[in-house]
């Protein structure tokens, strides 16, 4: 029989018959090592490769460029997949992005983008998006016209300030923009009036820090 092809992403995993959410190993084009990722097989038809997850504040997201480049955390809990991996995956084929959010009152919402990819490291992992829909606000809380990735040691934003230092975490800051899902985790009761929290402006406003977030991608032709 034909030799089995390695999984490029969680869509391949799903289409191979593995339809339970969990950790799987994928083989990304141009990456020397396989990568363990969390695959969400439940939301909106499944096949989603999780690139970011926040849920309990157990992981420090205030990290430098190199760590955001290669990723940190554990796919079984809180983690950032790594910009180099996100770039490599989204260079394989066309992807959509879905962001699942939950506030401290238990309200859930999502934002979805028909097209998502990021540039390479030389391009500061610049964000490219098209076609926003969802329940987490009529307007997009991610910069649609493109923004470079910034960290505490790499200031690539459009502000006279240093957004990543001020708002914490690495993100596609503008000046500083309407979102930051890699900000400080604040617990219930402490999550209001926070400049540097986990923010999705058009869902909960400029200074509400969210309880949980998941960023996940899936091929357009899934």
């Amino acid at each position: 029989r034909e030799e089995e092809k390695p999984f490029r992403d969680c869509a391949d995993v799903y289409q191979a018959g593995f339809n339970k959410s969990g950790i799987y190993t994928i083989y990304i084009n141009n990456m020397p090592e396989p990568k363990k990722v969390f695959c969400n097989m439940d939301v909106n038809g499944g096949g989603w490769t999780v690139i970011q997850h926040r849920e309990d504040g157990s992981l420090d997201f205030q990290r430098g460029w190199k760590e955001y480049k290669m990723g940190f955390g554990n796919p079984s809990g809180e983690y950032w997949l790594g910009n180099e991996f996100i770039f490599a995956i989204t260079s394989q084929r066309q992807y959509m992005l879905r962001i699942e959010l939950m506030d401290w009152e238990g309200n859930r919402a999502y934002s979805q983008y028909d097209r998502f990819h990021i540039g390479n490291e030389k391009q500061n992992y610049r964000l490219y998006l098209k076609g926003h829909t969802g329940t987490a606000g009529k307007q997009s809380s991610l910069i649609l016209h493109g923004a470079d990735f910034s960290t505490k040691d790499a200031d690539n934003d459009n502000c006279m300030c240093k957004c990543a230092l001020m708002l914490t975490g690495g993100w596609w800051f503008d000046a500083c923009g309407p979102s930051n899902l890699n900000g400080m985790f604040y617990t219930a009761g402490q999550n209001h009036g926070k400049l540097n929290g986990i923010k999705w402006h058009y869902f909960k406003g400029p200074s509400y820090s969210l309880r949980s977030t998941t960023m996940m991608i899936r091929p357009l032709d899934f």
Partner: antibody, heavy 122, light 112 residues
Framework: EVQLVQSGGGVVQPGRSLRLSCAAS????????MHWVRQAPGKGLEWVSY????????YYADSVKGRFTISRDNAKNSLYLQMNSLRAEDTAVYYC???????????????WGQGTLVTVSS | DIVMTQSPLSLPVTPGEPASISCRSS???????????LDWYLQKPGQSPQLLIY???NRASGVPDRFSGSGSGTDFTLKISRVEAEDVGVYYC?????????FGQGTKLEIK
């Protein structure tokens, strides 16, 4: 390049009106809160008024409340200050100023206009 | 309204020497989110003010590293490690923690 170009100043009699304008360019105007700050001749700076990015939130200093009206036209990238019932003590250079951060996060003024002189005198 | 008090009001400095300006507020400027909304602005002769330091200690882009801000609560300081001729002008502190924003009366830095 961020630019705030002001116009509309001049000499006006007490009790009369004047409208100041501030034309913005080089940034997404509709994403930023905007302010008016004034400086009486030889004096320090005094905050006058604030309008949020969408125009839904507005604040005034007590000294101008009920007389001045701040407004914005995001389609025209413009900020305005309508000044009615002007008094001698309103004589000052008026500056428009942009929030440092977008989306109505307050951290001070990142950019200032060149200023326009309003003289209230009979 | 919060009263901001600067000292000294006049500061003659020899080029190359350090300079320090104090700013005190009538109430604490430490916001519940952990930030001190205290900015420093420089108004050079005949010009509009320009931002030097935001949120107490963060230098704005393009501001030389000889400028530094420090302090928390009610006491803040702007330091210039080595004054240059281009630093002349009036320095203002401004608080934005409590509405309305209020400015200090200004400190005039001049070259000896």
């Amino acid at each position: 390049e961020v630019q705030l170009v002001q116009s509309g100043g001049g000499v006006v009699q007490p009790g009369r009106s004047l409208r100041l304008s501030c034309a913005a360019s080089g940034f997404t105007f509709s994403s930023y809160g905007m302010h008016w700050v004034r400086q009486a001749p030889g004096k320090g700076l005094e905050w006058v008024s604030y309008i949020s990015s969408s125009g839904s939130t507005i604040y005034y200093a007590d000294s101008v409340k009920g007389r001045f009206t701040i407004s914005r036209d995001n389609a025209k990238n413009s900020l305005y200050l309508q000044m009615n019932s002007l008094r001698a003590e309103d004589t000052a250079v008026y500056y428009c100023a942009r929030d440092l951060l977008d989306y109505d996060i307050w951290t001070g003024y990142g950019y200032w206009g060149q200023g326009t002189l309003v003289t209230v005198s009979s | 309204d919060i009263v901001m008090t600067q000292s000294p009001l006049s500061l003659p400095v020899t080029p190359g020497e350090p300079a320090s300006i104090s700013c005190r507020s009538s109430q604490s400027l430490l916001h519940s989110n952990g930030y001190n909304y205290l900015d420093w602005y420089l108004q050079k002769p005949g010009q509009s003010p320009q931002l030097l330091i935001y949120a107490g200690s963060n230098r704005a882009s393009g501001v030389p590293d000889r400028f530094s801000g420090s302090g928390s609560g009610t006491d803040f300081t702007l330091k210039i490690s080595r004054v240059e001729a281009e630093d002349v002008g009036v320095y203002y502190c401004m608080q934005g923690t409590h509405w309305p924003p209020t400015f200090g009366q200004g400190t005039k830095l001049e070259i000896k």
